[in-house]
């Protein structure tokens, strides 16, 4: 079967600027090492938000300073992006690469539009 990556079309970040979504992939082979990358597309510019490589059956770990966290279960990755502000609203694309064993495969999702609304500042109380 073909490598296919599915992710939700739209997600709304919560009031603390945290957004979560599932990135699910159909695997054409029995990969033991998988790399998941979150990309942000604004206009035609694409930037990497975060990336993690994990061994199947193990947890995926992002770098300590990453704004992403996540858990994996089979061919499903639950991604959470933190610290988002209104200016970070955009299309977040999930890319999955089957790194080992060869052959290498790559799949890319259609993207999740994440909407972020900055919370209203609390009014001063007298």
């Amino acid at each position: 079967k073909a490598m296919h990556v599915a992710q939700p079309a739209v997600v709304l970040a919560n009031s603390r600027g945290t957004a979560s979504f599932v990135c699910e992939y159909a695997s054409p082979g029995k990969a033991t090492e998988v790399r998941v990358t979150v990309l942000r597309q604004a206009d035609s510019q694409v930037t990497e938000v975060c990336a993690a490589t994990y061994m199947m059956g193990n947890e995926l770990t992002f770098l300590d300073d990453s704004i992403c966290t996540g858990t994996s279960s089979g061919n499903q990755v639950n991604l959470t992006i933190q610290g988002l502000r209104a200016m970070d609203t955009g299309l977040y694309i999930c890319k999955v690469e089957l790194m080992y064993p060869p052959p290498y495969y790559m799949g890319i999702g259609n993207g999740t539009q994440i909407y972020v609304i900055d919370p209203e500042p609390c009014p001063d109380s007298d």
């Epitope: 490598m3 054409p28 694409v46 080992y100 290498y104 495969y105 790559m106 799949g107 890319i108």
Partner: antibody, heavy 120, light 107 residues
Framework: QVQLVESGGGVVQPGRSLILSCAAS????????MHWVRQAPGKGLEWVAV????????YYADSVKGRFTISRDNSKNTLYLQMSSLRAEDTAVYYC?????????????WGQGSLVTVSS | DIQMTQSPSSLSASVGDRVAITCRTS??????LNWYQQKPGKAPELLIY???SFQSGVPSRFRGSGSGTDFTLTISSLQPEDFATYYC?????????FGPGTKVDIK
């Protein structure tokens, strides 16, 4: 601007070895995967090998597996292809190419090529 | 390995003509197909790449379409500098493979 300059090609006898180099400039070399692609005289394009940006992963075409080794030196901004047990069918122009950041298996920029002729 | 076929293998056309080149893959590659242009004695140049939403700077007369196993490169109005050989290539899986090429020459 992006520049890729191959060197090391030439005439070599079957069974012998050769090392090709590709000097890169105009971009952050250590951020990109790099490929070798070859083209036999009058023929089409054939992908040879790729090395990941940090050297962590390498993949090869079946036709060269076990005979060719791709490597890189990020401190020198240089890509290498070590070719051993060369055969007549390895005769080709060898191009180095920069991969894409989003799509590694893409050839965004190409060098001018280096001709390798395997002949007795 | 993913096999690639291209048709036609060659075609003759005139400046201003609309030209279509098709590429077919032996299995689904989603939309991970790229097109290159090569002129005699020169290195290939990336023309159109996938996913198309990541693309910028492509002359508007060139358009890539398709998904799965069937893809098309269309040149809406052929210019003198477009006479060259065109290759499709999949970036879905190793080994990364090319089509055999389509040579576009002057009628």
């Amino acid at each position: 601007q992006v520049q890729l300059v191959e060197s090391g090609g030439g005439v070599v006898q079957p069974g012998r070895s050769l090392i090709l180099s590709c000097a890169a400039s105009g971009f952050t070399f250590s951020s990109y995967g790099m490929h070798w692609v070859r083209q036999a005289p009058g023929k089409g394009l054939e992908w040879v090998a790729v090395v990941w940006y940090d050297g962590s992963n390498k993949y090869y075409a079946d036709s060269v597996k076990g005979r060719f080794t791709i490597s890189r030196d990020n401190s020198k901004n240089t890509l290498y292809l070590q070719m051993s047990s060369l055969r007549a069918e390895d005769t080709a122009v060898y191009y180095c190419a920069r991969g894409g950041i989003v799509v590694p298996g893409l050839f965004e920029y190409w060098g001018q090529g280096s001709l390798v002729t395997v002949s007795s | 390995d993913i096999q690639m076929t291209q048709s036609p293998s060659s075609l003759s056309a005139s400046v201003g003509d609309r030209v279509a080149i098709t590429c077919r893959t032996s299995q689904s590659i989603s939309n991970l197909l790229n097109w290159y242009q090569q002129k005699p004695g020169k290195a290939p140049e990336l023309l159109i790449y996938a996913p198309s939403s990541f693309q910028s700077g492509v002359p508007s007369r060139f358009r890539g379409s398709g998904s799965g196993t069937d893809f098309t490169l269309t040149i809406s109005s052929l210019q003198p500098e477009d006479f060259a050989t065109y290759y499709c290539q999949q970036s879905y899986s190793t080994p990364f493979t090319f089509g055999p090429g389509t040579k576009v020459d002057i009628k």
